[in-house]
Interface confidence: low
Protein backbone atom coordinates (compact mmCIF):
# COMPACT_ATOMS: atom_id res chain seq x y z
CA UNK A 1 0.00 0.00 0.00
CA UNK A 2 2.77 2.46 0.95
CA UNK A 3 4.65 1.80 -2.24
CA UNK A 4 6.01 4.24 -4.77
CA UNK A 5 7.15 3.67 -8.34
CA UNK A 6 10.46 5.31 -9.25
CA UNK A 7 12.37 5.04 -12.47
CA UNK A 8 15.53 6.28 -14.08
CA UNK A 9 18.04 5.69 -16.83
CA UNK A 10 21.28 3.78 -16.53
CA UNK A 11 24.36 5.92 -15.87
CA UNK A 12 22.20 8.77 -14.57
CA UNK A 13 21.68 9.75 -10.96
CA UNK A 14 18.45 8.60 -9.31
CA UNK A 15 17.31 9.70 -5.87
CA UNK A 16 14.25 8.10 -4.28
CA UNK A 17 12.40 9.33 -1.20
CA UNK A 18 10.89 6.85 1.25
CA UNK A 19 7.10 6.86 0.74
CA UNK A 20 6.62 6.78 4.52
CA UNK A 21 7.36 10.07 6.19
CA UNK A 22 8.45 10.81 9.72
CA UNK A 23 10.00 13.54 11.80
CA UNK A 24 13.59 14.47 10.93
CA UNK A 25 14.78 12.97 14.20
CA UNK A 26 13.56 9.49 13.21
CA UNK A 27 16.12 7.14 11.71
CA UNK A 28 15.40 5.49 8.36
CA UNK A 29 16.87 2.10 7.42
CA UNK A 30 16.88 0.90 3.82
CA UNK A 31 16.99 -2.72 2.61
CA UNK A 32 17.02 -4.45 -0.74
CA UNK A 33 13.80 -6.44 -0.41
CA UNK A 34 14.78 -9.46 -2.50
CA UNK A 35 17.78 -10.26 -0.33
CA UNK A 36 16.84 -8.33 2.84
CA UNK A 37 20.36 -6.90 2.60
CA UNK A 38 20.90 -3.56 4.33
CA UNK A 39 21.77 -0.59 2.09
CA UNK A 40 24.97 1.07 3.34
CA UNK A 41 25.02 4.71 4.43
CA UNK A 42 28.64 5.35 3.48
CA UNK A 43 28.80 7.80 0.60
CA UNK A 44 31.67 5.97 -1.06
CA UNK A 45 29.19 3.32 -2.24
CA UNK A 46 27.51 3.74 -5.60
CA UNK A 47 24.13 3.00 -4.00
CA UNK A 48 23.72 4.39 -0.50
CA UNK A 49 21.06 5.53 1.95
CA UNK A 50 20.93 9.06 3.31
CA UNK A 51 18.05 9.37 5.78
CA UNK A 52 14.75 9.42 3.87
CA UNK A 53 16.64 9.32 0.57
CA UNK A 54 18.07 6.38 -1.37
CA UNK A 55 20.73 7.46 -3.85
CA UNK A 56 21.91 5.66 -6.98
CA UNK A 57 25.04 7.49 -8.17
CA UNK A 58 24.87 6.48 -10.93
CA UNK A 59 22.10 3.94 -11.50
CA UNK A 60 22.55 0.58 -13.21
CA UNK A 61 19.93 -1.67 -14.79
CA UNK A 62 20.78 -4.33 -12.19
CA UNK A 63 19.65 -1.95 -9.43
CA UNK A 64 16.02 -2.54 -10.44
CA UNK A 65 13.90 -4.07 -7.71
CA UNK A 66 11.93 -3.31 -4.59
CA UNK A 67 13.63 -1.45 -1.76
CA UNK A 68 12.21 -1.36 1.76
CA UNK A 69 12.52 1.69 3.99
CA UNK A 70 11.71 1.50 7.69
CA UNK A 71 11.12 4.77 9.53
CA UNK A 72 11.96 4.11 13.18
CA UNK A 73 10.66 6.17 16.08
CA UNK A 74 10.88 5.42 19.81
CA UNK A 75 7.30 4.11 19.79
CA UNK A 76 6.64 2.61 16.35
CA UNK A 77 8.09 1.62 12.99
CA UNK A 78 6.62 2.52 9.60
CA UNK A 79 7.49 0.51 6.50
CA UNK A 80 7.42 1.73 2.93
CA UNK A 81 8.46 0.26 -0.39
CA UNK A 82 10.20 1.90 -3.34
CA UNK A 83 9.73 -0.01 -6.58
CA UNK A 84 12.74 1.07 -8.62
CA UNK A 85 13.20 0.35 -12.32
CA UNK A 86 16.31 1.39 -14.19
CA UNK A 87 16.05 1.36 -17.98
CA UNK A 88 18.65 1.23 -20.71
CA UNK A 89 19.03 4.49 -22.62
CA UNK A 90 17.02 4.62 -25.83
CA UNK A 91 18.99 4.91 -29.03
CA UNK A 92 16.19 6.75 -30.83
CA UNK A 93 14.42 9.96 -29.87
CA UNK A 94 11.17 8.40 -28.64
CA UNK A 95 10.56 8.55 -24.90
CA UNK A 96 8.44 5.50 -23.98
CA UNK A 97 5.36 5.91 -21.79
CA UNK A 98 6.98 4.14 -18.85
CA UNK A 99 9.59 6.90 -18.59
CA UNK A 100 7.04 9.74 -18.62
CA UNK A 101 6.08 11.76 -15.56
CA UNK A 102 2.60 13.21 -15.09
CA UNK A 103 1.16 15.32 -17.90
CA UNK A 104 0.77 19.04 -17.22
CA UNK A 105 -1.60 21.45 -18.90
CA UNK A 106 -1.02 25.05 -19.77
CA UNK A 107 -2.86 27.95 -21.29
CA UNK A 108 -1.93 31.30 -22.77
CA UNK A 109 -1.75 32.81 -19.29
CA UNK A 110 -0.10 29.92 -17.45
CA UNK A 111 2.55 27.95 -19.25
CA UNK A 112 4.93 26.66 -16.60
CA UNK A 113 6.39 23.18 -17.01
CA UNK A 114 8.07 21.98 -13.83
CA UNK A 115 11.02 19.63 -14.04
CA UNK A 116 9.80 16.47 -12.23
CA UNK A 117 11.56 15.23 -9.04
CA UNK A 118 14.22 17.97 -9.26
CA UNK A 119 13.65 19.02 -5.64
CA UNK A 120 15.30 15.77 -4.53
CA UNK A 121 18.60 16.69 -6.16
CA UNK A 122 21.45 19.05 -5.44
CA UNK A 123 21.45 20.95 -8.71
CA UNK A 124 22.36 24.38 -9.96
CA UNK A 125 20.71 26.46 -12.66
CA UNK A 126 20.34 26.65 -15.54
CA UNK A 127 18.30 23.65 -16.60
CA UNK A 128 18.48 22.44 -20.19
CA UNK A 129 15.14 21.85 -21.88
CA UNK A 130 14.29 19.80 -24.95
CA UNK A 131 11.02 19.28 -26.83
CA UNK A 132 10.68 16.01 -28.72
CA UNK A 133 14.48 15.68 -28.31
CA UNK A 134 15.27 19.06 -29.87
CA UNK A 135 17.01 21.70 -27.72
CA UNK A 136 14.63 24.62 -27.19
CA UNK A 137 15.79 27.84 -28.79
CA UNK A 138 14.20 31.22 -29.20
CA UNK A 139 13.00 34.05 -27.00
CA UNK A 140 9.63 32.39 -26.31
CA UNK A 141 11.32 29.82 -24.09
CA UNK A 142 12.67 30.84 -20.70
CA UNK A 143 14.31 28.39 -18.30
CA UNK A 144 13.53 29.85 -14.88
CA UNK A 145 14.85 27.99 -11.85
CA UNK A 146 13.19 24.56 -11.86
CA UNK A 147 10.60 25.26 -14.54
CA UNK A 148 10.23 26.27 -18.16
CA UNK A 149 8.06 29.22 -19.15
CA UNK A 150 6.65 29.39 -22.68
CA UNK A 151 5.45 32.80 -23.83
CA UNK A 152 2.37 33.13 -26.06
CA UNK A 153 1.49 29.45 -25.86
CA UNK A 154 0.00 27.91 -29.01
CA UNK A 155 -1.54 24.50 -29.62
CA UNK A 156 1.66 23.51 -31.48
CA UNK A 157 3.55 23.81 -28.18
CA UNK A 158 1.96 20.56 -26.99
CA UNK A 159 4.44 17.69 -26.83
CA UNK A 160 6.99 15.90 -24.69
CA UNK A 161 9.39 18.14 -22.78
CA UNK A 162 12.61 16.85 -21.23
CA UNK A 163 14.61 18.67 -18.60
CA UNK A 164 18.27 17.86 -18.10
CA UNK A 165 20.34 18.90 -15.11
CA UNK A 166 23.44 17.96 -13.15
CA UNK A 167 23.31 16.52 -9.62
CA UNK A 168 26.40 17.23 -7.53
CA UNK A 169 27.39 14.86 -4.73
CA UNK A 170 30.65 15.49 -2.89
CA UNK A 171 32.21 17.16 -5.92
CA UNK A 172 31.15 14.48 -8.41
CA UNK A 173 28.64 15.38 -11.13
CA UNK A 174 25.88 13.10 -12.41
CA UNK A 175 23.44 13.77 -15.22
CA UNK A 176 19.65 13.49 -14.72
CA UNK A 177 16.88 13.72 -17.31
CA UNK A 178 13.12 13.68 -16.81
CA UNK A 179 10.32 13.92 -19.38
CA UNK A 180 6.67 14.90 -19.16
CA UNK A 181 3.93 15.73 -21.66
CA UNK A 182 2.54 19.22 -21.99
CA UNK A 183 -0.97 19.85 -23.28
CA UNK A 184 -2.48 23.20 -24.19
CA UNK A 185 -5.91 24.22 -22.93
CA UNK A 186 -7.97 26.89 -24.61
CA UNK A 187 -10.34 27.79 -21.82
CA UNK A 188 -9.31 29.97 -18.92
CA UNK A 189 -9.55 28.43 -15.47
CA UNK A 190 -10.41 30.02 -12.17
CA UNK A 191 -10.13 29.13 -8.51
CA UNK A 192 -12.70 29.50 -5.76
CA UNK A 193 -13.03 28.95 -2.02
CA UNK A 194 -12.72 25.17 -1.48
CA UNK A 195 -15.95 23.20 -1.64
CA UNK A 196 -15.93 19.91 0.30
CA UNK A 197 -18.10 17.32 -1.41
CA UNK A 198 -17.42 14.59 1.14
CA UNK A 199 -17.75 14.04 3.99
CA UNK A 200 -20.79 16.02 5.00
CA UNK A 201 -20.28 18.45 7.88
CA UNK A 202 -20.60 16.66 11.26
CA UNK A 203 -21.12 13.33 9.52
CA UNK A 204 -21.27 10.22 11.71
CA UNK A 205 -19.63 7.23 10.03
CA UNK A 206 -20.46 3.77 11.25
CA UNK A 207 -17.51 1.41 11.60
CA UNK A 208 -16.97 -2.10 12.92
CA UNK A 209 -14.46 -2.68 15.69
CA UNK A 210 -11.57 -4.83 14.45
CA UNK A 211 -12.28 -4.11 10.79
CA UNK A 212 -10.62 -1.60 8.47
CA UNK A 213 -12.30 1.70 7.66
CA UNK A 214 -11.71 4.31 4.97
CA UNK A 215 -12.75 7.97 5.08
CA UNK A 216 -12.48 10.04 1.92
CA UNK A 217 -12.00 13.80 1.98
CA UNK A 218 -13.00 15.16 -1.42
CA UNK A 219 -12.96 18.83 -2.35
CA UNK A 220 -13.16 21.00 -5.46
CA UNK A 221 -11.21 24.18 -6.00
CA UNK A 222 -12.27 25.70 -9.30
CA UNK A 223 -11.98 25.13 -13.01
CA UNK A 224 -8.84 24.19 -14.89
CA UNK A 225 -5.39 23.52 -13.46
CA UNK A 226 -5.13 24.35 -9.76
CA UNK A 227 -1.54 24.93 -8.67
CA UNK A 228 -2.18 25.78 -5.03
CA UNK A 229 -4.71 23.41 -3.58
CA UNK A 230 -4.61 20.57 -1.07
CA UNK A 231 -6.82 18.24 0.92
CA UNK A 232 -5.68 16.48 4.07
CA UNK A 233 -6.90 14.88 7.27
CA UNK A 234 -6.33 15.92 10.87
CA UNK A 235 -6.85 13.91 14.04
CA UNK A 236 -7.88 15.86 17.13
CA UNK A 237 -6.38 18.98 15.58
CA UNK A 238 -3.06 17.28 14.77
CA UNK A 239 -1.48 16.39 11.42
CA UNK A 240 -1.60 12.65 10.68
CA UNK A 241 2.20 12.47 10.47
CA UNK A 242 2.53 14.03 13.92
CA UNK A 243 -0.27 12.04 15.56
CA UNK A 244 1.93 8.97 15.83
CA UNK A 245 -0.66 6.22 15.32
CA UNK A 246 0.73 3.90 12.62
CA UNK A 247 -2.68 2.24 12.11
CA UNK A 248 -4.05 5.53 10.78
CA UNK A 249 -2.54 6.82 7.56
CA UNK A 250 -3.60 9.15 4.78
CA UNK A 251 -3.10 8.41 1.13
CA UNK A 252 -3.50 10.67 -1.87
CA UNK A 253 -6.54 9.66 -3.88
CA UNK A 254 -7.50 10.58 -7.41
CA UNK A 255 -7.11 14.03 -8.90
CA UNK A 256 -10.51 14.41 -10.51
CA UNK A 257 -11.62 16.68 -13.30
CA UNK A 258 -15.33 16.61 -13.95
CA UNK A 259 -17.28 17.13 -17.17
CA UNK A 260 -18.24 20.59 -15.93
CA UNK A 261 -14.51 21.37 -15.69
CA UNK A 262 -14.29 21.40 -11.89
CA UNK A 263 -10.90 20.32 -10.54
CA UNK A 264 -11.12 18.22 -7.40
CA UNK A 265 -8.76 16.32 -5.08
CA UNK A 266 -9.28 13.30 -2.83
CA UNK A 267 -7.40 12.24 0.28
CA UNK A 268 -8.23 8.85 1.79
CA UNK A 269 -7.79 8.21 5.51
CA UNK A 270 -7.18 4.52 6.14
CA UNK A 271 -7.80 3.16 9.63
CA UNK A 272 -6.57 -0.39 10.10
CA UNK A 273 -8.10 -2.63 12.76
CA UNK A 274 -10.52 -0.04 14.20
CA UNK A 275 -10.30 0.20 17.99
CA UNK A 276 -12.64 1.60 20.63
CA UNK A 277 -10.37 4.58 21.21
CA UNK A 278 -10.73 5.57 17.53
CA UNK A 279 -14.38 6.37 18.25
CA UNK A 280 -13.28 9.12 20.64
CA UNK A 281 -11.21 10.99 18.06
CA UNK A 282 -12.32 13.96 15.99
CA UNK A 283 -11.54 13.53 12.27
CA UNK A 284 -11.22 16.75 10.29
CA UNK A 285 -11.22 16.86 6.52
CA UNK A 286 -9.37 20.03 5.49
CA UNK A 287 -9.47 21.62 2.06
CA UNK A 288 -7.35 24.67 1.43
CA UNK A 289 -6.09 26.94 -1.28
CA UNK A 290 -5.15 30.60 -1.57
CA UNK A 291 -8.75 31.62 -0.84
CA UNK A 292 -8.68 29.93 2.55
CA UNK A 293 -9.45 26.77 4.46
CA UNK A 294 -12.67 24.79 4.86
CA UNK A 295 -13.07 22.07 7.48
CA UNK A 296 -15.64 19.27 7.78
CA UNK A 297 -15.65 17.18 10.94
CA UNK A 298 -16.46 13.48 11.09
CA UNK A 299 -16.92 11.22 14.07
CA UNK A 300 -16.99 7.45 14.13
CA UNK A 301 -19.69 5.38 15.76
CA UNK A 302 -19.87 1.66 16.35
CA UNK A 303 -21.96 -0.22 13.81
CA UNK A 304 -24.33 -2.38 15.81
CA UNK A 305 -24.31 -5.99 14.65
CA UNK A 306 -27.69 -7.08 13.29
CA UNK A 307 -29.72 -8.80 15.97
CA UNK A 308 -31.20 -11.86 14.23
CA UNK A 309 -33.43 -12.70 17.23
CA UNK A 310 -35.54 -9.56 17.18
Amino acid sequence: KFSKQSWGLENEALIVRCPRQGKPSYTVDWYYSQTNKSIPTQERNRVFASGQLLKFLPAAVADSGIYTCIVRSPTFNRTGYANVTIYKKQSDCNVPDYLMYSTVSGSEKNSKIYCPTIDLYNWTAPLEWFKNCQALQGSRYRAHKSFLVIDNVMTEDAGDYTCKFIHNENGANYSVTATRSFTVKDEQGFSLFPVIGAPAQNEIKEVEIGKNANLTCSACFGKGTQFLAAVLWQLNGTKITDFGEPRIQQEEGQNQSFSNGLACLDMVLRIADVKEEDLLLQYDCLALNLHGLRRHTVRLSRKNPIDHHS
Epitope: Q21, K23, P24, Y114, P116, D119, L120, N122, H144, K145, S146, F147, F227, L228, A229, A230, L232, Q234, K239, T241, E252, L286, L288, N289, L290, L293
Partner: nanobody, 122 residues
Amino acid sequence: ESGGGSVQAGGSLRVSCAASGYTYSSYCMGWFRQAPGKEREGVASIDSRGSTTYADSLKGRFTISKDNAKNTLYLQMNNLKPEDTAKYYCAAGDGYGLEHICIPHYYAMNYWGEGTQVTVSS
Protein backbone atom coordinates in the same frame (compact mmCIF):
# COMPACT_ATOMS: atom_id res chain seq x y z
CA GLU B 1 15.24 33.36 14.07
CA SER B 2 16.71 36.76 14.81
CA GLY B 3 16.00 40.43 14.21
CA GLY B 4 12.92 40.81 16.37
CA GLY B 5 12.51 43.67 18.77
CA SER B 6 10.46 46.75 19.59
CA VAL B 7 9.52 49.41 17.07
CA GLN B 8 7.14 52.35 16.80
CA ALA B 9 4.04 52.10 14.61
CA GLY B 10 4.94 52.96 11.02
CA GLY B 11 8.48 51.63 11.47
CA SER B 12 10.23 48.71 9.78
CA LEU B 13 11.96 45.52 10.90
CA ARG B 14 13.65 42.62 9.15
CA VAL B 15 13.64 39.22 10.80
CA SER B 16 15.81 36.41 9.54
CA CYS B 17 16.06 32.67 9.95
CA ALA B 18 19.17 30.56 9.33
CA ALA B 19 18.39 27.02 8.17
CA SER B 20 20.44 24.03 7.18
CA GLY B 21 20.66 21.19 4.70
CA TYR B 22 17.59 19.75 3.01
CA THR B 23 15.41 21.67 5.41
CA TYR B 24 16.52 24.78 3.57
CA SER B 25 17.06 23.87 -0.04
CA SER B 26 14.29 21.44 -0.92
CA TYR B 27 11.28 22.76 0.88
CA CYS B 28 8.50 25.23 1.11
CA MET B 29 9.50 27.79 3.74
CA GLY B 30 7.38 30.34 5.50
CA TRP B 31 6.83 32.87 8.25
CA PHE B 32 4.07 32.51 10.80
CA ARG B 33 3.08 34.63 13.76
CA GLN B 34 1.20 34.11 16.99
CA ALA B 35 -0.19 36.95 19.06
CA PRO B 36 -0.98 36.33 22.75
CA GLY B 37 -4.21 34.36 23.12
CA LYS B 38 -4.59 33.86 19.36
CA GLU B 39 -3.97 30.99 16.97
CA ARG B 40 -0.77 30.83 14.97
CA GLU B 41 -1.39 32.37 11.55
CA GLY B 42 0.44 32.19 8.24
CA VAL B 43 2.18 35.35 7.06
CA ALA B 44 4.07 34.42 3.89
CA SER B 45 5.74 31.51 2.16
CA ILE B 46 8.36 30.95 -0.52
CA ASP B 47 8.99 27.74 -2.43
CA SER B 48 12.21 26.21 -3.73
CA ARG B 49 11.75 28.12 -6.98
CA GLY B 50 11.39 31.47 -5.23
CA SER B 51 7.64 31.86 -5.82
CA THR B 52 6.01 33.76 -2.96
CA THR B 53 2.56 33.72 -1.35
CA TYR B 54 1.22 36.16 1.26
CA ALA B 55 -1.69 36.33 3.66
CA ASP B 56 -4.38 38.57 2.15
CA SER B 57 -4.53 40.77 5.23
CA LEU B 58 -0.97 42.10 4.85
CA LYS B 59 -1.75 44.32 1.84
CA GLY B 60 1.81 44.41 0.52
CA ARG B 61 3.49 45.57 3.73
CA PHE B 62 5.59 42.41 4.18
CA THR B 63 8.11 40.83 1.81
CA ILE B 64 9.51 37.30 2.13
CA SER B 65 12.83 36.45 0.50
CA LYS B 66 15.71 34.04 0.83
CA ASP B 67 19.43 34.00 0.22
CA ASN B 68 20.40 30.56 -1.03
CA ALA B 69 24.10 31.23 -0.60
CA LYS B 70 23.62 31.99 3.10
CA ASN B 71 20.80 29.44 3.67
CA THR B 72 18.79 32.26 5.21
CA LEU B 73 15.12 33.20 5.05
CA TYR B 74 14.03 36.82 5.57
CA LEU B 75 10.84 38.73 6.31
CA GLN B 76 10.94 42.46 5.66
CA MET B 77 8.12 44.20 7.56
CA ASN B 78 7.25 47.79 6.64
CA ASN B 79 4.64 50.23 7.96
CA LEU B 80 4.23 48.10 11.08
CA LYS B 81 1.02 48.38 13.09
CA PRO B 82 0.30 47.53 16.75
CA GLU B 83 -1.75 44.53 15.57
CA ASP B 84 1.47 43.10 14.05
CA THR B 85 2.74 42.52 17.60
CA ALA B 86 3.37 38.77 17.89
CA LYS B 87 6.00 36.09 18.09
CA TYR B 88 7.22 35.35 14.55
CA TYR B 89 8.19 31.81 13.61
CA CYS B 90 10.13 30.52 10.64
CA ALA B 91 9.06 27.11 9.31
CA ALA B 92 9.87 24.66 6.53
CA GLY B 93 7.90 21.78 5.12
CA ASP B 94 7.24 19.52 2.17
CA GLY B 95 4.03 21.23 1.07
CA TYR B 96 1.77 18.29 2.01
CA GLY B 97 4.05 15.92 0.11
CA LEU B 98 2.37 17.15 -3.07
CA GLU B 99 4.43 18.61 -5.86
CA HIS B 100 4.97 22.38 -5.81
CA ILE B 101 2.35 23.36 -3.26
CA CYS B 102 3.63 26.01 -0.92
CA ILE B 103 1.09 28.00 1.08
CA PRO B 104 1.64 29.67 4.47
CA HIS B 105 -0.56 27.18 6.32
CA TYR B 106 0.45 25.28 9.44
CA TYR B 107 -0.33 21.95 7.79
CA ALA B 108 2.30 22.40 5.09
CA MET B 109 5.17 22.68 7.57
CA ASN B 110 7.27 19.98 9.22
CA TYR B 111 10.04 21.98 10.89
CA TRP B 112 9.67 25.00 13.18
CA GLY B 113 12.02 27.59 14.64
CA GLU B 114 11.90 28.85 18.22
CA GLY B 115 10.39 32.21 17.31
CA THR B 116 11.39 35.86 17.70
CA GLN B 117 9.26 38.52 19.41
CA VAL B 118 8.14 41.63 17.50
CA THR B 119 6.46 44.39 19.49
CA VAL B 120 4.90 47.43 17.80
CA SER B 121 3.84 50.31 20.03
CA SER B 122 1.50 53.10 18.98
